[in-house]
Protein backbone atom coordinates (compact mmCIF):
# COMPACT_ATOMS: atom_id res chain seq x y z
CA UNK A 1 0.00 0.00 0.00
CA UNK A 2 1.40 3.38 -1.01
CA UNK A 3 0.95 5.83 1.87
CA UNK A 4 3.61 8.37 1.01
CA UNK A 5 3.30 11.84 -0.46
CA UNK A 6 5.78 13.86 -2.46
CA UNK A 7 6.21 17.53 -1.62
CA UNK A 8 7.84 19.59 -4.36
CA UNK A 9 8.86 23.19 -4.92
CA UNK A 10 5.78 23.45 -7.14
CA UNK A 11 5.58 26.14 -9.82
CA UNK A 12 8.78 28.14 -9.83
CA UNK A 13 10.41 30.78 -11.95
CA UNK A 14 13.99 31.89 -12.43
CA UNK A 15 16.00 34.32 -14.50
CA UNK A 16 17.72 33.46 -17.75
CA UNK A 17 21.41 32.80 -17.09
CA UNK A 18 20.76 32.01 -13.44
CA UNK A 19 20.37 28.76 -11.59
CA UNK A 20 17.57 27.00 -9.75
CA UNK A 21 17.28 24.13 -7.29
CA UNK A 22 14.66 21.49 -8.02
CA UNK A 23 13.62 19.75 -4.83
CA UNK A 24 11.25 16.92 -3.93
CA UNK A 25 10.68 15.33 -0.56
CA UNK A 26 8.99 12.00 0.10
CA UNK A 27 7.14 11.82 3.41
CA UNK A 28 4.52 9.78 5.29
CA UNK A 29 6.11 6.45 4.42
CA UNK A 30 8.78 4.21 5.90
CA UNK A 31 9.63 2.86 2.44
CA UNK A 32 13.30 2.74 1.52
CA UNK A 33 14.29 5.05 -1.34
CA UNK A 34 16.36 2.98 -3.76
CA UNK A 35 16.71 5.51 -6.56
CA UNK A 36 15.54 8.97 -7.60
CA UNK A 37 15.32 9.90 -11.28
CA UNK A 38 15.04 13.47 -12.51
CA UNK A 39 13.41 13.99 -15.90
CA UNK A 40 12.39 16.86 -18.12
CA UNK A 41 9.41 15.57 -20.09
CA UNK A 42 10.75 12.16 -21.14
CA UNK A 43 14.39 13.18 -21.13
CA UNK A 44 16.54 11.84 -18.31
CA UNK A 45 18.56 14.53 -16.52
CA UNK A 46 20.07 12.60 -13.64
CA UNK A 47 19.84 9.57 -11.38
CA UNK A 48 20.66 9.34 -7.70
CA UNK A 49 21.05 5.69 -6.74
CA UNK A 50 21.22 4.63 -3.09
CA UNK A 51 24.07 2.21 -3.83
CA UNK A 52 25.98 3.98 -6.54
CA UNK A 53 25.43 7.70 -6.04
CA UNK A 54 24.82 10.22 -8.81
CA UNK A 55 24.78 9.75 -12.56
CA UNK A 56 24.26 12.85 -14.71
CA UNK A 57 23.16 12.34 -18.31
CA UNK A 58 26.08 13.24 -20.63
CA UNK A 59 24.02 15.82 -22.53
CA UNK A 60 23.36 17.75 -19.29
CA UNK A 61 26.75 17.38 -17.58
CA UNK A 62 27.73 21.02 -18.14
CA UNK A 63 24.54 22.50 -16.75
CA UNK A 64 23.26 20.10 -14.10
CA UNK A 65 24.76 19.59 -10.65
CA UNK A 66 23.71 16.96 -8.12
CA UNK A 67 22.10 18.06 -4.87
CA UNK A 68 21.48 19.45 -2.45
CA UNK A 69 20.36 16.11 -1.03
CA UNK A 70 18.26 14.27 -3.58
CA UNK A 71 17.53 17.55 -5.36
CA UNK A 72 19.03 18.85 -8.57
CA UNK A 73 20.60 22.19 -9.47
CA UNK A 74 20.10 23.57 -12.98
CA UNK A 75 22.62 26.16 -14.07
CA UNK A 76 23.03 28.65 -16.94
CA UNK A 77 19.28 28.63 -17.52
CA UNK A 78 17.84 29.41 -20.93
CA UNK A 79 14.26 30.09 -22.00
CA UNK A 80 14.27 26.58 -23.51
CA UNK A 81 14.53 25.16 -19.97
CA UNK A 82 10.96 26.28 -19.34
CA UNK A 83 8.71 23.27 -18.81
CA UNK A 84 7.79 20.35 -16.60
CA UNK A 85 10.31 18.50 -14.47
CA UNK A 86 9.64 15.24 -12.67
CA UNK A 87 11.24 13.58 -9.67
CA UNK A 88 10.60 9.84 -9.74
CA UNK A 89 11.19 8.03 -6.47
CA UNK A 90 11.74 4.27 -6.67
CA UNK A 91 11.05 2.84 -3.24
CA UNK A 92 10.73 -0.54 -1.57
CA UNK A 93 8.25 -1.91 -0.76
CA UNK A 94 5.89 0.88 -1.84
CA UNK A 95 6.93 1.26 -5.46
CA UNK A 96 7.11 4.40 -7.59
CA UNK A 97 6.19 7.94 -6.54
CA UNK A 98 6.23 10.88 -8.94
CA UNK A 99 6.44 14.61 -8.22
CA UNK A 100 6.01 17.43 -10.74
CA UNK A 101 7.64 20.85 -10.88
CA UNK A 102 6.91 23.51 -13.48
CA UNK A 103 9.82 25.86 -14.18
CA UNK A 104 9.44 29.12 -16.06
CA UNK A 105 12.64 30.81 -17.16
CA UNK A 106 12.11 34.57 -17.49
CA UNK A 107 14.02 37.15 -19.51
CA UNK A 108 13.62 39.84 -16.86
CA UNK A 109 14.35 39.96 -13.15
CA UNK A 110 10.77 39.48 -12.00
CA UNK A 111 11.19 35.77 -11.25
CA UNK A 112 9.37 34.74 -8.10
CA UNK A 113 9.03 31.40 -6.39
CA UNK A 114 5.57 29.81 -6.41
CA UNK A 115 3.90 28.22 -3.42
CA UNK A 116 4.72 24.72 -2.32
CA UNK A 117 2.18 22.03 -3.01
CA UNK A 118 1.77 18.30 -2.52
CA UNK A 119 1.20 15.42 -4.89
CA UNK A 120 -0.06 12.16 -3.40
Amino acid sequence: MMTGTIETTGNISAEKGGSIILQCHLSSTTAQVTQVNWEQQDQLLAICNADLGWHISPSFKDRVAPGPGLGLTLQSLTVNDTGEYFCIYHTYPDGTYTGRIFLEVLESSVAEHGARFQIP
Epitope: T34, L52, Y92
Partner: antibody, heavy 119, light 107 residues
Framework: EVMLVESGGGLVKPGGSLKLSCAAS????????MSWVRQTPEKRLEWVAT????????YYPDSVKGRFTISRDNAKNTLYLQMSSLRSEDTALYYC????????????WGQGTSVTVSS | DIQMNQSPSSLSASLGDTITITCHAS??????LNWYQQKPGNIPKLLIY???NLHTGVPSRFSGSGSGTGFTLTISSLQPEDIATYYC?????????FGGGTKLEIK
Protein backbone atom coordinates in the same frame (compact mmCIF):
# COMPACT_ATOMS: atom_id res chain seq x y z
CA GLU B 1 27.35 -6.92 -26.76
CA VAL B 2 25.37 -7.48 -23.56
CA MET B 3 25.30 -11.16 -22.61
CA LEU B 4 23.67 -12.95 -19.69
CA VAL B 5 24.24 -16.70 -19.35
CA GLU B 6 22.43 -18.67 -16.65
CA SER B 7 23.47 -22.05 -15.26
CA GLY B 8 22.79 -24.33 -12.30
CA GLY B 9 19.29 -25.53 -13.08
CA GLY B 10 18.20 -29.14 -12.77
CA LEU B 11 15.87 -31.65 -11.16
CA VAL B 12 15.46 -31.39 -7.41
CA LYS B 13 13.17 -33.03 -4.85
CA PRO B 14 10.61 -30.96 -2.86
CA GLY B 15 12.35 -29.38 0.13
CA GLY B 16 15.69 -29.44 -1.67
CA SER B 17 18.06 -26.63 -2.61
CA LEU B 18 19.67 -25.31 -5.76
CA LYS B 19 21.94 -22.39 -6.61
CA LEU B 20 21.60 -20.62 -9.95
CA SER B 21 24.30 -18.45 -11.50
CA CYS B 22 24.20 -15.80 -14.19
CA ALA B 23 27.44 -14.72 -15.87
CA ALA B 24 27.27 -11.19 -17.26
CA SER B 25 29.44 -9.58 -19.90
CA UNK B 26 29.41 -6.65 -22.31
CA UNK B 27 28.46 -3.97 -19.77
CA UNK B 28 29.53 -2.47 -16.44
CA UNK B 29 27.83 -5.07 -14.28
CA UNK B 30 28.15 -3.19 -10.98
CA UNK B 31 26.19 -0.21 -12.33
CA UNK B 32 23.00 -2.17 -12.94
CA UNK B 33 20.18 -3.46 -10.81
CA MET B 34 19.59 -7.12 -11.67
CA SER B 35 16.65 -9.49 -11.26
CA TRP B 36 15.57 -13.08 -11.54
CA VAL B 37 12.29 -13.71 -13.34
CA ARG B 38 10.76 -17.12 -13.88
CA GLN B 39 8.45 -18.51 -16.53
CA THR B 40 6.14 -21.29 -15.42
CA PRO B 41 5.26 -24.31 -17.58
CA GLU B 42 1.99 -22.45 -18.34
CA LYS B 43 4.16 -19.60 -19.76
CA ARG B 44 3.28 -17.10 -17.05
CA LEU B 45 6.05 -14.68 -16.06
CA GLU B 46 6.75 -14.06 -12.36
CA TRP B 47 9.22 -11.67 -10.76
CA VAL B 48 11.38 -13.60 -8.27
CA ALA B 49 14.06 -11.29 -6.83
CA THR B 50 15.94 -8.05 -7.41
CA UNK B 51 19.31 -6.79 -6.21
CA UNK B 52 20.76 -3.29 -6.45
CA UNK B 53 24.00 -2.56 -8.31
CA UNK B 54 26.21 -2.53 -5.25
CA UNK B 55 24.40 -5.48 -3.73
CA UNK B 56 23.26 -3.51 -0.70
CA UNK B 57 19.54 -3.88 -1.29
CA UNK B 58 17.51 -6.97 -2.14
CA TYR B 59 13.79 -7.35 -2.84
CA TYR B 60 11.50 -10.38 -3.04
CA PRO B 61 7.82 -11.20 -3.51
CA ASP B 62 6.13 -12.94 -0.58
CA SER B 63 6.02 -16.22 -2.52
CA VAL B 64 9.81 -16.72 -2.22
CA LYS B 65 10.75 -14.49 0.72
CA GLY B 66 12.71 -16.45 3.31
CA ARG B 67 13.38 -19.30 0.87
CA PHE B 68 15.32 -17.60 -1.94
CA THR B 69 18.36 -15.35 -1.64
CA ILE B 70 19.66 -13.16 -4.46
CA SER B 71 23.31 -12.07 -4.36
CA ARG B 72 26.02 -10.84 -6.67
CA ASP B 73 29.79 -10.83 -7.01
CA ASN B 74 30.69 -7.68 -8.92
CA ALA B 75 34.34 -8.73 -9.14
CA LYS B 76 33.25 -11.85 -11.03
CA ASN B 77 30.39 -10.17 -12.93
CA THR B 78 28.06 -12.87 -11.64
CA LEU B 79 24.55 -12.91 -10.24
CA TYR B 80 23.27 -15.73 -8.03
CA LEU B 81 19.99 -17.13 -6.77
CA GLN B 82 20.15 -19.52 -3.83
CA MET B 83 16.90 -21.45 -3.64
CA SER B 84 15.94 -23.60 -0.66
CA SER B 85 12.81 -25.34 0.66
CA LEU B 86 11.83 -25.78 -2.98
CA ARG B 87 8.23 -26.56 -3.87
CA SER B 88 6.59 -28.00 -6.95
CA GLU B 89 5.25 -24.54 -7.80
CA ASP B 90 8.85 -23.30 -8.14
CA THR B 91 9.20 -25.43 -11.29
CA ALA B 92 9.99 -22.95 -14.05
CA LEU B 93 12.53 -21.57 -16.48
CA TYR B 94 14.58 -19.01 -14.53
CA TYR B 95 15.88 -15.93 -16.35
CA CYS B 96 18.31 -13.35 -15.08
CA UNK B 97 17.56 -9.88 -16.37
CA UNK B 98 19.19 -6.46 -16.33
CA UNK B 99 17.24 -3.33 -15.49
CA UNK B 100 17.59 -0.08 -17.39
CA UNK B 101 19.66 2.46 -15.44
CA UNK B 102 16.42 4.38 -14.96
CA UNK B 103 14.97 1.24 -13.36
CA UNK B 104 11.86 1.44 -15.53
CA UNK B 105 12.08 -1.97 -17.23
CA UNK B 106 14.26 -5.03 -17.80
CA UNK B 107 16.09 -4.46 -21.06
CA UNK B 108 18.20 -7.62 -21.41
CA TRP B 109 17.38 -11.21 -20.45
CA GLY B 110 19.46 -14.36 -20.44
CA GLN B 111 18.48 -17.58 -22.16
CA GLY B 112 17.23 -19.10 -18.91
CA THR B 113 17.97 -22.23 -16.88
CA SER B 114 15.33 -24.85 -16.14
CA VAL B 115 14.41 -25.88 -12.59
CA THR B 116 12.13 -28.86 -12.00
CA VAL B 117 10.93 -29.66 -8.49
CA SER B 118 9.52 -33.16 -8.37
CA SER B 119 9.69 -36.28 -6.26
CA ASP C 1 -0.88 -7.26 -5.42
CA ILE C 2 -1.75 -5.44 -8.63
CA GLN C 3 -3.41 -7.77 -11.13
CA MET C 4 -2.64 -7.28 -14.82
CA ASN C 5 -5.33 -8.53 -17.18
CA GLN C 6 -4.39 -8.83 -20.83
CA SER C 7 -6.81 -9.28 -23.69
CA PRO C 8 -7.24 -11.05 -25.92
CA SER C 9 -5.30 -14.13 -24.77
CA SER C 10 -4.80 -15.08 -28.41
CA LEU C 11 -5.18 -13.23 -31.66
CA SER C 12 -5.04 -14.17 -35.34
CA ALA C 13 -4.40 -11.46 -37.92
CA SER C 14 -3.25 -11.05 -41.50
CA LEU C 15 0.02 -9.58 -42.71
CA GLY C 16 -0.31 -5.82 -43.09
CA ASP C 17 -3.07 -5.58 -40.47
CA THR C 18 -3.04 -3.23 -37.51
CA ILE C 19 -3.65 -5.03 -34.24
CA THR C 20 -4.24 -3.83 -30.68
CA ILE C 21 -3.55 -5.65 -27.43
CA THR C 22 -4.91 -4.25 -24.20
CA CYS C 23 -3.69 -4.49 -20.63
CA HIS C 24 -5.85 -3.53 -17.65
CA ALA C 25 -4.40 -2.92 -14.19
CA SER C 26 -6.47 -3.62 -11.08
CA UNK C 27 -5.41 -0.24 -9.69
CA UNK C 28 -3.82 2.98 -10.89
CA UNK C 29 -0.25 2.41 -12.10
CA UNK C 30 0.28 5.87 -13.62
CA UNK C 31 2.52 5.25 -16.68
CA UNK C 32 4.57 2.44 -15.16
CA LEU C 33 3.72 -0.16 -17.76
CA ASN C 34 6.15 -2.13 -19.95
CA TRP C 35 5.57 -4.40 -22.92
CA TYR C 36 7.73 -7.42 -23.78
CA GLN C 37 7.78 -9.63 -26.85
CA GLN C 38 8.63 -13.34 -26.65
CA LYS C 39 9.04 -15.14 -29.95
CA PRO C 40 8.47 -18.93 -30.05
CA GLY C 41 11.36 -20.74 -28.33
CA ASN C 42 13.03 -17.46 -27.49
CA ILE C 43 13.47 -15.09 -24.55
CA PRO C 44 11.42 -12.02 -23.61
CA LYS C 45 12.61 -8.78 -25.19
CA LEU C 46 11.70 -5.27 -24.09
CA LEU C 47 9.57 -3.41 -26.62
CA ILE C 48 8.10 -0.43 -24.78
CA TYR C 49 8.76 1.04 -21.36
CA UNK C 50 6.89 3.65 -19.35
CA UNK C 51 3.72 3.04 -21.40
CA UNK C 52 4.81 4.72 -24.62
CA ASN C 53 8.61 4.82 -24.92
CA LEU C 54 10.04 2.64 -27.67
CA HIS C 55 13.12 0.69 -26.57
CA THR C 56 16.29 1.03 -28.65
CA GLY C 57 16.13 -0.87 -31.94
CA VAL C 58 12.39 -1.59 -31.80
CA PRO C 59 10.64 -0.86 -35.14
CA SER C 60 8.37 2.19 -35.20
CA ARG C 61 5.37 0.06 -36.19
CA PHE C 62 5.13 -0.76 -32.47
CA SER C 63 3.53 1.84 -30.25
CA GLY C 64 2.14 2.00 -26.74
CA SER C 65 -0.34 4.27 -25.05
CA GLY C 66 -2.39 4.66 -21.91
CA SER C 67 -2.10 5.68 -18.28
CA GLY C 68 -3.82 4.89 -15.02
CA THR C 69 -5.42 1.48 -15.46
CA GLY C 70 -5.82 1.07 -19.23
CA PHE C 71 -3.00 0.49 -21.72
CA THR C 72 -2.68 -0.61 -25.32
CA LEU C 73 0.06 -2.02 -27.52
CA THR C 74 -0.50 -1.38 -31.20
CA ILE C 75 1.33 -3.09 -34.05
CA SER C 76 0.71 -1.50 -37.42
CA SER C 77 1.44 -3.21 -40.73
CA LEU C 78 1.88 -6.65 -39.19
CA GLN C 79 5.03 -8.50 -40.31
CA PRO C 80 5.84 -12.26 -40.21
CA GLU C 81 8.51 -11.63 -37.57
CA ASP C 82 5.87 -10.21 -35.21
CA ILE C 83 4.57 -13.72 -34.46
CA ALA C 84 5.12 -13.90 -30.71
CA THR C 85 3.51 -13.74 -27.30
CA TYR C 86 3.27 -10.23 -25.85
CA TYR C 87 3.34 -9.52 -22.11
CA CYS C 88 2.62 -6.37 -20.15
CA UNK C 89 4.32 -5.71 -16.80
CA UNK C 90 3.59 -3.10 -14.15
CA UNK C 91 6.40 -1.28 -12.35
CA UNK C 92 4.24 0.86 -10.08
CA UNK C 93 4.45 -1.23 -6.94
CA UNK C 94 5.91 -4.41 -5.53
CA UNK C 95 5.55 -7.21 -6.32
CA UNK C 96 6.03 -6.40 -9.99
CA UNK C 97 3.44 -8.38 -11.92
CA PHE C 98 2.95 -9.46 -15.52
CA GLY C 99 -0.12 -9.97 -17.65
CA GLY C 100 -0.95 -13.48 -18.78
CA GLY C 101 0.25 -12.85 -22.31
CA THR C 102 -1.32 -12.47 -25.75
CA LYS C 103 -0.34 -15.02 -28.36
CA LEU C 104 -0.29 -13.46 -31.83
CA GLU C 105 -0.60 -15.69 -34.86
CA ILE C 106 -0.74 -14.96 -38.57
CA LYS C 107 -3.85 -16.03 -40.53
Amino acid sequence: EVMLVESGGGLVKPGGSLKLSCAASGFTFSSYTMSWVRQTPEKRLEWVATISGGGGNTYYPDSVKGRFTISRDNAKNTLYLQMSSLRSEDTALYYCARWLLTYYAMDYWGQGTSVTVSS
Amino acid sequence: DIQMNQSPSSLSASLGDTITITCHASQNINVWLNWYQQKPGNIPKLLIYKASNLHTGVPSRFSGSGSGTGFTLTISSLQPEDIATYYCQQGQSYPYTFGGGTKLEIK
